[in-house]
Interface confidence: low
């Protein structure tokens, strides 16, 4: 078994003589939202090229975050092997990475890198000096069971909105329940200490329930 | 341990046609990228083709390009390689290799490769 990390000019039928394309990226980027644009620059016009950008994050490149795939006669593939969410737009000279529900925990350094694979001759890129993207802002926990985008914020505002309507609506009913309950058992409480103009034997259940009165002070 | 066996290699006439697989063990085949390069005799490394984990994408060397296919069966941990209208220059050692990244970043891994040899 060979076990080999190969450079690029180890491979001499796809060398590129000098001829690396040129990365140019912002050195910071703040994600105050968890998202974030990051555009990578070329010294390279990408029109009508079978081509391979992507992001990688990290010093040594190890995540592969979203990657960009251009193909003269196909449409633009976009995605993410890695389980982040993004999206990409094709410039002429550039490809814009848009990162959405980042963690704060993803602060980390960003790498472009692009592969002209069509037409001869394949060309790749030096290697430029990143983009350091600090995530702030809300701070979204990460659940690896299901990874998943989080809702969108005025879902989240107009969900709120009707569980608040919904909170008021159901206190004011019970507000008015309750003073209608109460109403009604001031009434039913009087009308059952009332003296009985036929005493009998068939009201006598109720007075335990009956709370005692003092009717001398309904005298005038 | 990664282990990669390459088979399917042999003697073909100009014009014909070969088959080539490489069995893969000892790591999650159908998460990583796969290449396959070739060696001539007294020449340097050559990459052929490449195909991502999923399978849907592919890149071929200009050299190859519409007569070669690369594919790859992840329920068998198996990639392949379909040689069509083969050539005298297609005579090599050819090697299955994962490659973590893009096609043109390198391999880590690379099996012992199998001979094609292609003549009249």
């Known amino acids: 078994m060979l076990r080999l990390l190969l450079a690029l000019n180890l491979f001499p039928s796809i060398q590129v003589t000098g001829n690396k394309i040129l990365v140019k990226q912002s050195p910071m980027l703040v994600a105050y939202d968890n998202a974030v644009n990051l555009s990578c620059k070329y010294s390279y016009n990408l029109f009508s090229r079978e081509f391979r950008a992507s992001l990688h994050k990290g010093l040594d490149s190890a995540v592969e975050v979203c990657v960009v795939y251009g193909n003269y006669s196909q449409q633009l593939q976009v995605y993410s092997k890695t389980g982040f969410n993004c999206d990409g737009k094709l410039g002429n000279e550039s490809v814009t990475f848009y990162l959405q529900n980042l963690y704060v925990n993803q602060t980390d350094i960003y790498f472009c890198k692009i592969e002209v694979m069509y037409p001869p001759p394949y060309l790749d890129n030096e290697k430029s000096n990143g983009t350091i993207i600090h995530v702030k802002g809300k701070h979204l926990c990460p659940s690896p069971l299901f990874p998943g985008p989080s809702k969108p914020f005025w879902v989240l505002v107009v969900v709120g909105g009707v569980l608040a309507c919904y909170s008021l609506l159901v206190t004011v009913a019970f507000i008015i329940f309750w003073v209608r309950s109460k109403r009604s058992r001031l009434l039913h409480s009087d009308y059952m200490n009332m003296t009985p103009r036929r005493p009998g034997p068939t009201r006598k259940h109720y007075q335990p329930y009956a709370p005692p009165r003092d009717f001398a002070a309904y005298r005038s | 341990e990664v282990q990669l066996l390459e088979s399917g290699g042999g003697l073909v006439q100009p014009g014909g046609s070969l088959r080539l697989s490489c069995a893969a063990s000892?790591?999650?085949?159908?998460?990583?990228?796969m290449s396959w390069a070739r060696q001539a005799p007294g020449k340097g490394l050559e990459w052929v083709s490449w195909?991502?984990?999923?399978?849907?994408?592919?890149f071929y060397a200009d050299s190859v390009r519409g007569r070669f296919t690369i594919s790859r069966d992840n329920s068998k941990n198996t990639l392949y390689l379909q040689m069509n209208s083969l050539r005298a220059e297609d005579t090599a050692v050819y090697y299955c290799?994962?490659?973590?990244?893009?096609?043109?970043?390198?391999?880590?891994?690379m099996g012992q490769g199998t001979l094609v040899t292609v003549s009249s």
């Open positions: 290799a994962r490659s973590p990244f893009g096609p043109l970043y390198g391999f880590d891994y």
């Open positions: 000892g790591f999650t085949f159908d998460s990583a990228n």
């Open positions: 195909i991502e984990a999923p399978g849907v994408q592919t």
